[in-house]
């Protein structure tokens, strides 16, 4: 007869491991007992369990409640056992020693491999600001056994670097994603992808990029200077900019306070029916946590009685 087993049994942490040991005997041969032991190199055999044809299953105190025979029906030549709720410390070499009649004793070894799936974590880097050089956008760390693979999935252009730390029974892998921040990256997903043989599918953690910036400011509303004449209603100036975080707007008049009746509504400056009092230099001040910008315009309110038109100056300043 001969023993049938596996060279390697692979199981995911927390699952049950079936340790196979089947005696393929000749007709009339019987198995008296099967002794299972852990036999890691440099250490003596440690009892796991004993399956006896008469006495039944004996489980070592160290494995009490964790070793069982497979559910019935059971073949009397089958010395396989189930190791419940495999933990990392169970990884190692196991031996089944089968005592048969009349053929004598046989033994076989197998290696139990316990896969420890990673629980990845993604840590964003420092705040990203337009104008910075190469900057850490995010780092992703995953620890498992064997070492997991950590990659990035994104449309954003950048560079990656990885490092790993070996522990006694696992390895931690950290991958960093660096980029040169630009406003076009705002709202773009950056996804850490972790692969591991203990995972049914890759684990993905997505981080949305936020790049702080503030665009140049400009003022719209003076495109047709002839519309700015005494008595015109609904005249308005609109300050144009964009930023992350979204900016706030403030209007002032350079050559004095805002005239009465002029309404400030965020980025818009609304005028009552125009008079010559509304002529002046108006400044739009745009700011966010990242930066601030100014844009100023000169408003000349035309008197229709006068033949000659007035010049309108648009000046943009930062």
């Amino acid at each position: 007869g001969e023993l049938e087993t596996s060279d390697v049994v692979t199981v995911v942490l927390g699952q049950d491991a079936k340790l196979p040991c089947f005696y393929r005997g000749d007709s009339g041969e019987q198995v008296g007992q099967v002794a299972w032991a852990r036999v890691d190199a440099g250490e003596g055999a440690q009892e796991l369990a004993l399956l006896h044809s008469k006495y039944g299953l004996h489980v070592s105190p160290a494995y009490e409640g964790r070793v069982e025979q497979p559910p019935p029906p059971r073949n009397p030549l089958d010395g396989s056992v189930l190791l419940r709720n495999a933990v990392q410390a169970d990884e190692g070499e196991y031996e089944c020693r089968v005592s048969t009649f009349p053929a004598g004793s046989f033994q076989a070894r197998l290696r139990l491999r316990v896969l420890v799936p990673p629980l990845p974590s993604l840590n964003p880097g420092p705040a990203l600001e337009e104008g910075q050089g190469l900057t850490l956008a995010a780092s992703c760390t995953a620890e498992g056994s064997p070492a997991p693979s950590v990659t990035w999935d994104t449309e954003v252009k950048g560079t990656t670097s990885s490092r790993s730390f070996k522990h006694s029974r696992s390895a931690a892998v950290t991958s960093e994603f660096h980029l040169v921040p630009s406003r076009s990256m705002n709202g773009q997903p950056l996804t850490c992808v972790v692969s591991h043989p203990g995972l049914l599918q890759d684990q993905r953690i997505t981080h949305i990029l936020h790049v702080s910036f503030l665009a140049e400011a400009s003022v719209r509303g003076l495109e047709d200077q002839n519309l700015w004449h005494i008595g015109r209603e609904g005249a308005m100036l609109k300050c144009l900019s964009e930023g992350q975080p979204p900016p706030s707007y403030n209007w002032t008049r350079l050559d004095g306070p805002l005239p009465s009746g002029v309404r400030v509504d965020g980025d818009t400056l609304g005028f009552p029916p125009l008079t010559t009092e509304h002529s002046g230099i108006y400044v739009c001040h745009v700011s966010n946590e990242f930066s601030s910008r100014d844009s100023q315009v000169t408003v000349d309110v035309l008197d229709p009685q006068e033949d000659s038109g007035k010049q309108v100056d648009l000046v943009s300043a930062s």
Partner: antibody
Framework: EVQLVESGGGLVQPGGSLRLSCAAS????????MSWVRQAPGKGLEWVSG????????YYADSVKGRFTISRDNSKNTLYLQMNSLRAEDTAVYYC????????????????WGQGTLVTVSS | DIQMTQSPSSLSASVGDRVTITCRAS??????LAWYQQKPGKAPKLLIY???SLQSGVPSRFSGSGSGTDFTLTISSLQPEDFATYYC?????????FGQGTKVEIK
């Protein structure tokens, strides 16, 4: 024919010592683990101590730990129990018994027993 | 330690009666259970090992059953030489422990 014969029992004062012997014959002595089991007058059976076939592994009941020592001389096919600091509650008939090693520290039931030797601890 | 609880502690029966003695272990012991018979002034004698296997030379009227925690010794037809004290013993763990015994007396 398997035979186990105990000797060495007797009357001893509390605090005294006694050495029991069990001579085995009729089988391969080293193939079997051996035990001492006692029975106080009118009481049930109580396992006292056990030893593996090689003598490497020894086991004791909590009630005798630190006072009794089990040993064996495989060249003489003899099992021993050295009893020190004896107490009145150690008074009993002491039996030796054999059990076959299955594997590790797992043994069969004790299939052969000696006739017993009486130990009386009294002042 | 594993506790072995035997019942009854004593019973009276007549020759030819069917006698049943039970033994319960405080935790599972598979079939690592033996039954012994002891007569006054004599050493215990192994009757049943591995819960249900008859020791060589023991009459077939003795039988054992059970596994795990609950075990039974049955004497199918009590004979005059069967009046004795019966003990169960577990040898699943060290220390091996005995039940307190069941004394079978003549009614």
């Amino acid at each position: 024919e398997v035979q186990l014969v105990e000797s060495g029992g007797g009357l001893v004062q509390p605090g005294g010592s006694l050495r029991l012997s069990c001579a085995a014959s009729g089988y391969n002595f080293t193939d079997y683990g051996m035990s001492w089991v006692r029975q106080a007058p009118g009481k049930g059976l109580e396992w006292v101590s056990g030893i593996s076939g090689s003598g490497d592994n020894k086991y004791y009941a909590d009630s005798v730990k630190g006072r009794f020592t089990i040993s064996r001389d495989n060249s003489k096919n003899t099992l021993y129990l050295q009893m020190n600091s004896l107490r009145a509650e150690d008074t009993a008939v002491y039996y030796c018994a054999r059990a076959e090693l299955l594997a590790f520290d797992v043994y069969t039931a004790s299939d052969y027993w000696g006739q017993g030797t009486l130990v009386t601890v009294s002042s | 330690d594993i506790q072995m609880t035997q019942s009854p502690s004593s019973l009276s029966a007549s020759v030819g009666d069917r006698v049943t003695i039970t033994c319960r272990a405080s935790q599972g012991i598979s079939s690592y259970l033996a039954w012994y018979q002891q007569k006054p002034g004599k050493a215990p004698k192994l009757l049943i090992y591995a819960a249900s296997s008859l020791q060589s030379g023991v009459p077939s009227r003795f039988s054992g059953s059970g596994s795990g925690t609950d075990f039974t010794l049955t004497i199918s037809s009590l004979q005059p030489e069967d009046f004795a004290t019966y003990y169960c013993q577990q040898h699943y763990t060290t220390p091996p422990t005995f039940g307190q015994g069941t004394k079978v007396e003549i009614k």
